[in-house]
């Protein structure tokens, strides 16, 4: 089976890397622009340079292209708490991040947010925090794995899932009120 | 078929409080981060809150950071808004959404779904 080309795909198919078809004239192969530039004028003819310019401030390509503008630059969101590891150039993006012990969580695929790495309080590190993922912490005896922090197991009521890992707890205070009564 | 009811809004004194809520149907709602937008008169929209699956990780926007508390209650594919210290400003139409997405270079996050929204309105 022919994998199913887009038209652009078709047109670029036709000549060699590196080169794309004329959109006025097919039996033209003009070569592409550099990355950190864009297309401001098909070749005129075989042999004759494509006419690139580099993009302006703001703007990048990050590889060879047949664009007709640039892209715009991505901008870090600071109420996401982004900041930014690396500035925009002509030939690449802004890379954006996250701060020392933070860790990105997704919103969705290229939108993430900045939280703090858990700490571990009342317990220990499982898996140490990662740049797309939290630490993964293992509570002491008497504590229990809420939102991936380790709280009392005082504050466990019997509706919740913390049952079973207070349930030595529990049944510990109900024997120490049940010893009072002879 | 997907369905986000939204309901609690009405009319409110400055520094009251509101809690909407909004009842999703026709998808797996536990599997699904839920968002609050709203839409102020002659405004556009702005993504207010978001919550995802578990209710470990919350979003904010800065104007009602500190006043607003998002949360769901998977057992009842149930999403929240809880409302405190309302000003003038926080007057809008309150959609609950789902399916964000968002690329660099065009700014605004878009959504998949919406509810047909609640009229939140803050006068004395």
């Known amino acids: 089976l022919v994998p199913h080309l887009g038209d652009r795909e078709k047109r670029d198919s036709v000549c060699p890397q590196g080169k794309y078809i004329h959109p006025q004239n097919n039996s033209i192969c003009c070569t592409k622009c550099h990355k950190g530039t864009y297309l401001y004028n098909d070749c005129p003819g075989p042999g004759q340079d494509t006419d690139c310019r580099e993009c302006e401030s703001g703007s990048f390509t990050a590889s060879e292209n047949h664009l007709r503008h640039c892209l715009s630059c991505s901008k870090c969101r600071k109420e996401m708490g982004q900041v930014e590891i690396s500035s925009c150039t002509v030939d690449r993006d802004t890379v954006c991040g996250c701060r020392k012990n933070q860790y990105r969580h997704y919103w969705s695929e290229n939108l993430f947010q900045c939280f703090n790495c858990s700490l571990c309080l009342n317990g220990t590190v499982h898996l140490s925090c990662q740049e797309k993922q939290n630490t993964v912490c293992t509570c002491h005896a008497g504590f229990f794995l809420r939102e991936n922090e380790c709280v009392s197991c005082s504050n466990c009521k019997k509706s919740l899932e913390c049952t079973k890992l207070c349930l030595p707890q529990i049944e510990n205070v109900k024997g120490t009120e049940d010893s009072g009564t002879t | 078929e997907v369905q986000l009811l939204e309901s609690g809004g009405g009319l409110v004194q400055p520094g009251g409080s509101l809690r909407l809520s909004c009842a999703a149907s026709?998808?797996?709602?536990?599997?699904?981060?839920m968002y609050w937008v709203r839409q102020a008169p002659g405004k556009g929209l702005e993504w207010v809150s978001g919550?995802?699956?578990?209710?470990?990780?919350?979003y904010y926007a800065d104007s009602v950071k500190g006043r607003f508390t998002i949360s769901r209650d998977n057992s009842k594919n149930t999403l929240y808004l809880q409302m405190n210290s309302l000003r003038a400003e926080d007057t809008a139409v309150y959609y609950c959404?789902?399916?964000?997405?968002?690329?660099?270079?065009?700014?605004?996050?878009?959504?998949?779904?919406w509810g047909q929204g609640t009229l939140v309105t803050v006068s004395s």
């Open positions: 026709g998808f797996t709602f536990p599997t699904e981060h």
């Open positions: 919550i995802d699956t578990g209710g470990s990780h919350t």
């Open positions: 959404a789902k399916g964000l997405h968002w690329s660099s270079d065009s700014g605004p996050v878009h959504f998949d779904y």
